[in-house]
Interface confidence: medium
């Protein structure tokens, strides 16, 4: 006859938050401090993640779940489960291998992370530039020149200037 799993393996009865203690006749023992088991039937408890240095604790470790970290102010998460912290830059900048660098002319970044992106080309939509772009803000497109009432004028964008490229990344 087929024996049930619990008869085959007494450890399968140990719930999350405990481990099957071989040193104590496979009794279910609670996870020691700073450790956890998120599933039943485990023979060991896993060490809790420690949020140190640039990491800070978002969720404390419990006997059944690992701690969760995020990054201290001025940094943001990278990698699976916030495994790394990357520095924030200012608006109008992007992070390169050499640190934070200002956006090149004709590009902007309105966030503290992410990359500089080209200003919107208003003329592609048959519109005119209402407000010039900056390092921190995209241009604002207005009605097309044909839509403007007589005598109204639109702001013309300056001709794009070439700036020396940033070092990669």
């Amino acid at each position: 006859f087929e024996r049930t799993r619990s008869l085959q393996d007494p450890c399968s009865n140990c719930p999350a938050g405990t481990f099957c203690d071989n040193n104590r006749n496979q009794i279910c023992s609670p996870c020691p401090p700073n450790s956890f088991s998120s599933a039943g039937g485990q023979r060991t408890c896993d060490i809790c993640r420690q949020c140190k240095g640039v990491f800070r604790t978002r969720k404390e470790c419990s006997s059944t779940s690992n701690a969760e970290c995020d990054c201290t102010p001025g940094f943001h998460c990278l990698g699976a489960g916030c495994s790394m912290c990357e520095q924030d830059c200012k608006q109008g900048q992007e992070l390169t291998k050499k640190g934070c660098k200002d956006c090149c002319f004709g590009t902007f970044n309105d966030q503290k992370r992410g990359i500089c992106r080209p200003w919107t080309n208003c003329s592609l939509d048959g519109k005119s530039v209402l407000v010039n772009g900056t390092k921190e803000r995209d241009v604002v497109c207005g009605p097309s020149p044909a839509d403007l009432s007589p005598g109204a004028s639109s702001v013309t964008p300056p001709a794009p200037a070439r700036e020396p490229g940033h070092s990669p990344q």
Epitope: L78, E86, L95, K97, K98, P168
Partner: antibody, heavy 118, light 110 residues
Framework: EVQLLESGGGLVQPGGSLRLSCAAS????????MSWVRQAPGKGLEWVAN????????YYGDSATGRFTISRDNSKNTLYLQMNSLRAEDTAVYYC???????????WGQGTLVTVSS | QSVLTQPPSASGTPGQRVTISCSGS????????VYWYQQLPGTAPKLLIY???QRPSGVPDRFSGSKSGTSASLAISGLRSEDEADYYC???????????FGGGTKLTVL
């Protein structure tokens, strides 16, 4: 979950061409530099090339300059490596890697094997 | 010949501390961050150390990185059998405008 899946490897004769692809998912592809790194059988890692988020800047290792072209299609979340004038020494596993802005490779594909032999 | 120089092999017994060196120049290690990768047989490399001495979560604190001038090193304390792998250092090189790797160090746990 971030996934990088390379394809296009195989057996090719010396002087031949091959185009590798890397399908990316689980992240905003257009926000990141992407790279190709290769590893010849029993040898170390060798950086091949990388490409800026919008494709406007491309950088190549010595072995790739003049023969390989890196490109990307952000609308398809796909990275490419066009390899021409292939030589026996180009035989390697080619990995696609997502380059974090701090300049490191945290996510790698599983690799695709390119064999150049007659 | 790799731009970054590593010893081809290193070894130690369980519990020991092992250090792997990586030597470069002012164009790479001297002016850019150093990264360390671990590669187990038949698998893609795994990031161990970023920005000279930062450890991604999930990497045991037995692994530590340091940098001084144009050299860097990876230290592994409390060596375990599962640490047996190839280890690579890497850095951006400003003169080559590219990423450079060390030749790799094969670590054997005796």
């Amino acid at each position: 979950e971030v996934q990088l899946l390379e394809s296009g490897g195989g057996l090719v004769q010396p002087g031949g061409s091959l185009r590798l692809s890397c399908a990316a998912s689980g992240f905003t592809f257009s926000d990141y530099y992407m790279s190709w790194v290769r590893q010849a059988p029993g040898k170390g890692l060798e950086w091949v090339a990388n490409i800026k988020q919008d494709g406007s800047e491309k950088y190549y290792g010595d072995s790739a300059t003049g023969r390989f072209t890196i490109s990307r299609d952000n609308s398809k979340n796909t990275l490419y490596l066009q390899m021409n004038s292939l030589r026996a020494e180009d035989t390697a596993v080619y990995y696609c890697a997502k380059e974090e802005r701090i300049g490191t490779y945290y996510y790698w594909g599983q690799g695709t094997l390119v064999t150049v032999s007659s | 010949q790799s731009v970054l120089t590593q010893p081809p092999s290193a070894s130690g017994t369980p519990g020991q501390r092992v250090t792997i060196s990586c030597s470069g120049s002012s164009f790479n290690i001297g002016s850019n961050y150093v990264y360390w990768y671990q590669q187990l047989p038949g698998t893609a490399p795994k990031l161990l150390i970023y920005k000279n001495n930062q450890r991604p979560s999930g990497v045991p604190d037995r692994f530590s990185g340091s940098k001084s001038g144009t050299s860097a090193s990876l230290a592994i304390s409390g060596l375990r059998s599962e640490d047996e792998a190839d280890y690579y250092c890497a850095a951006w090189d400003d003169s080559l405008n590219g990423q450079v790797f060390g030749g790799g160090t094969k670590l054997t746990v005796l």
